[in-house]
């Protein structure tokens, strides 16, 4: 058993049929010694008396809010949550496996630049009695500070018969060094509590591996005289790290016909313009990627050819 | 060329070669997600590699003030990786084909380090840990770790030379 926060405790249980469970001793936070009784949740049934209460925690029915009273007055509470371990593996019932970039990916994180600011998100099908708390650091043995906000519900989607809820959190490294080569990964830890079930999820990454620039901005076409060619120009996104002579991007320009089956013409360039042939009903799209490190491409910025 | 005394390197040549290094490093190990190398028990090699750290002067302001600290750090790293890529970690099983980018990568590391430090001048270099893993899986794991680490190192070096070529070239 360990303390998650004040008056909230997590009991770690090996979860299998007829498991013996864990013996837990609760102590009433009071100077009183006599006349103390214990109850669980809203029940008025007295579970025991005395300053301490010993219970055998085996299942969710044994978890909940234990309260000690004296003469009708509440003295203190202890909330017990369960953390299940099945076949040596901690349960992951609360969050959905996003399966990208690999199986058992519950948390996904992205950064728009090298400033040390990043966003993580996760999915669940649970709509109520759900709380999250997020902590982060750079490195684990001698951790350097990363400050995370509160997790918020950022999107709701309908998937078949199920509703899916996306939560996200923003974090910022306290003393970020955008130009340095990271040697210690960022660690993100999410505590999830659904009713009386506790789970924790972690992710470990370098900012450089989660970079995904915003799409290029101000995408414009300039027709070239007496030609089917156009000059496409664009600019670096505002959110990208500066100076651009140091934090450079590379770009992919694509001409795509109306039908998905039509052949796509692609050009790669380090410049912020390119000359392409504009076909009728086609559209021109441009996306960006870090020039020197192959992290994710941005989403496409697009304009119609006409 | 950068000499310990402090003249400027051939920024544009260094820029071109460092960008080529980035491409080669990603050709040699293009996979990001196929195995989480940090879960696989950290070998000493990748802990001991020279990283370009915050105080090394490789940020735009540091380069403007005095690029020598940064160039020395980059040179140290190039020599370190060049020795690693030439070691028996990259020979033996699993077999690398003769078209492997590792050969070109090795040569380009040497080429860039020579651009930064012509013969006759000597910056301190870092000892490479002596590692000769006997099992193919240990060797492959080390290769992947070294290449992932090299990708990060050459990315910073390429930014330095690109910025230098754009703002510090005579």
């Amino acid at each position: 058993i360990w303390e998650l926060k004040k008056d909230v405790y997590v009991v770690e249980l090996d979860w299998y049929p007829d498991a013996p469970g864990e013996m837990v001793v609760l102590t009433c936070d009071t100077p009183e010694e006599d006349g103390i009784t214990w109850t669980l949740d809203q029940s008025s049934e007295v579970l025991g008396s005395g300053k301490t209460l010993t219970i055998q925690v085996k299942e969710f029915g044994d978890a909940g809010q234990y309260t000690c009273h004296k003469g009708g007055e509440v003295l203190s509470h202890s909330l017990l949550l369960l953390h299940k371990k099945e076949d040596g593996i901690w349960s992951t019932d609360i969050l959905k496996d996003q399966k990208e970039p690999k199986n058992k990916t519950f948390l996904r994180c992205e950064a728009k630049n090298y400033s040390g600011r990043f966003t993580c998100w996760w999915l669940t099908t649970i709509s109520t009695d759900l709380t999250f708390s997020v902590k982060s650091s750079r490195g684990s043995s001698d951790p350097q500070g990363v400050t995370c906000g509160a997790a918020t519900l950022s999107a709701e989607r309908v998937r078949g018969d199920n509703k899916e809820y996306e939560y996200s959190v923003e974090c910022q490294e306290d003393s970020a060094c955008p130009a340095a080569e990271e040697s210690l990964p960022i660690e993100v830890m999410v505590d999830a509590v659904h009713k009386l079930k506790y789970e924790n999820y972690t992710s470990s990454f370098f900012i450089r591996d989660i970079i995904k620039p915003d799409p290029p901005k101000n995408l414009q076409l300039k027709p070239l005289k007496n030609s089917r060619q156009v000059e496409v120009s664009w600019e670096y996104p505002d959110t990208w790290s500066t100076p651009h002579s140091y934090f450079s991007l590379t770009f992919c320009v694509q001409v795509q016909g109306k039908s998905k089956r039509e052949k796509k013409d692609r050009v790669f360039t380090d410049k912020t313009s390119a000359t392409v042939i504009c076909r009728k009903n086609a559209s021109i799209s441009v996306r960006a990627q870090d020039r020197y490190y192959s992290s994710s491409w941005s989403e496409w910025a697009s304009v119609p050819c006409s | 060329r950068a000499v310990p005394g402090g003249s400027s390197p051939a920024w544009t040549q260094c820029q071109q070669l460092s960008q080529k290094l980035c491409t080669l490093a990603w050709s040699a190990h293009p996979l990001v997600g196929h195995m989480d190398l940090r879960e696989e028990g950290d070998e000493e090699t990748t802990n001991d590699v020279p990283h370009i750290q915050c105080g090394d002067g490789c940020d735009p302001q540091g380069l403007r003030d005095n690029s020598q600290f940064c160039l020395q750090r980059i040179h140290q790293g190039l020599i370190f990786y060049e020795k690693l890529l030439g070691s028996d970690i990259f020979t033996g099983e699993p077999s690398l084909l003769p078209d492997s980018p590792v050969g070109q990568l090795h040569a380009s590391l040497l080429g860039l380090s020579q651009l930064l430090q012509p013969e006759g001048h000597h910056w301190e270099t870092q000892q490479i840990p002596s590692l000769s893993p006997s099992q193919p899986w240990q060797r492959l794991l080390l290769r992947f770790k070294i290449l992932r680490s090299l990708q990060a190192f050459v990315a910073v070096a390429a930014r330095v030379f690109a910025h230098g070529a754009a703002t510090l070239s005579p």
């Epitope: - | 003769p98 078209d99 980018p101």
Partner: antibody
């Protein structure tokens, strides 16, 4: 895009030779090794060897040494595999293939295969 | 030479079934193992390399696992178009060698 086009099916007499070609396009021919495999009817695959066109250096599976000669013609971006002293057990589909660019031999692109039948 | 012992040599399963094919290397090949699919009369097609990395465009129902000597190809939910021969292949050591193949049919 990368393409490997092999020569057509051949019927040969025991003791004779056959030369199968593999014309490559869509990439720089001298940049990558070209490998040859064979698959006897209803059987698995066997790796025969490769040629690295940049320096014309072949490498063979010991089991095929003396039986096979692999060459390359840079001017036409074509690799060749010649089988000599043919016997009935050489009847198989022969494939050329090129691996991933990272320098390890998992084969991404394959020729369409050439059936060589050895029969008297 | 490294032997790649593949099993079973043939198997019949129903659409939607989970199918597992195994390959055992006669010595350590790290994760230098690929899996190929070959449909009747067609060319082998790369499915998995580095033991577990799906090649571009390969459906997510195909997955690979294993390291050193024991490797597995899994099809999580068999589809009619998965009828084919499947081969494992080690590219750790010369000469590169292949498993003898598994013929997969639909019940």
């Amino acid at each position: 895009q990368v393409q490997l086009v092999q020569s057509g099916a051949e019927v040969k007499k025991p003791g004779s030779s056959v030369k199968v070609s593999c014309k490559a396009s869509g990439y720089t021919f001298t940049d990558q090794t070209i490998h040859w495999m064979r698959q006897a009817p209803g059987q698995g695959l066997e790796w025969i060897g490769y040629i690295y066109p940049r320096d014309d250096s072949p490498k063979y599976n010991e089991n095929f040494k003396g039986k096979v000669t692999i060459t390359a013609d840079k001017s036409t971006s074509t690799a060749y595999m010649e089988l000599s002293s043919l016997r009935s057990e050489d009847t198989a589909v022969y494939y050329c293939a090129i691996p991933d660019r990272s320098g390890y031999a998992h084969f991404i692109y394959w020729g369409q295969g050439t059936l060589v039948t050895v029969s008297s | 030479d490294i032997q790649m012992t593949q099993s079973p040599s043939s198997l019949s399963a129903s659409v939607g079934d989970r199918v597992t094919i195994t390959c055992k290397a006669s010595r350590d090949v790290a994760i230098a193992v690929a899996w190929y699919q070959q449909k009747p009369g067609k060319v082998p097609k790369l499915l998995i390399y580095w033991a577990s990395t799906r090649h571009t465009g390969v459906p997510s129902r195909f997955s690979g696992s294993g390291s050193r000597t024991d490797f597995t190809l899994t099809i999580s939910s068999l589809q009619p178009e998965d009828v084919a021969d499947y081969f494992c292949h080690q590219y750790s050591s010369y000469p590169f060698t292949f498993g003898s193949g598994t013929k997969l049919e639909i019940k």
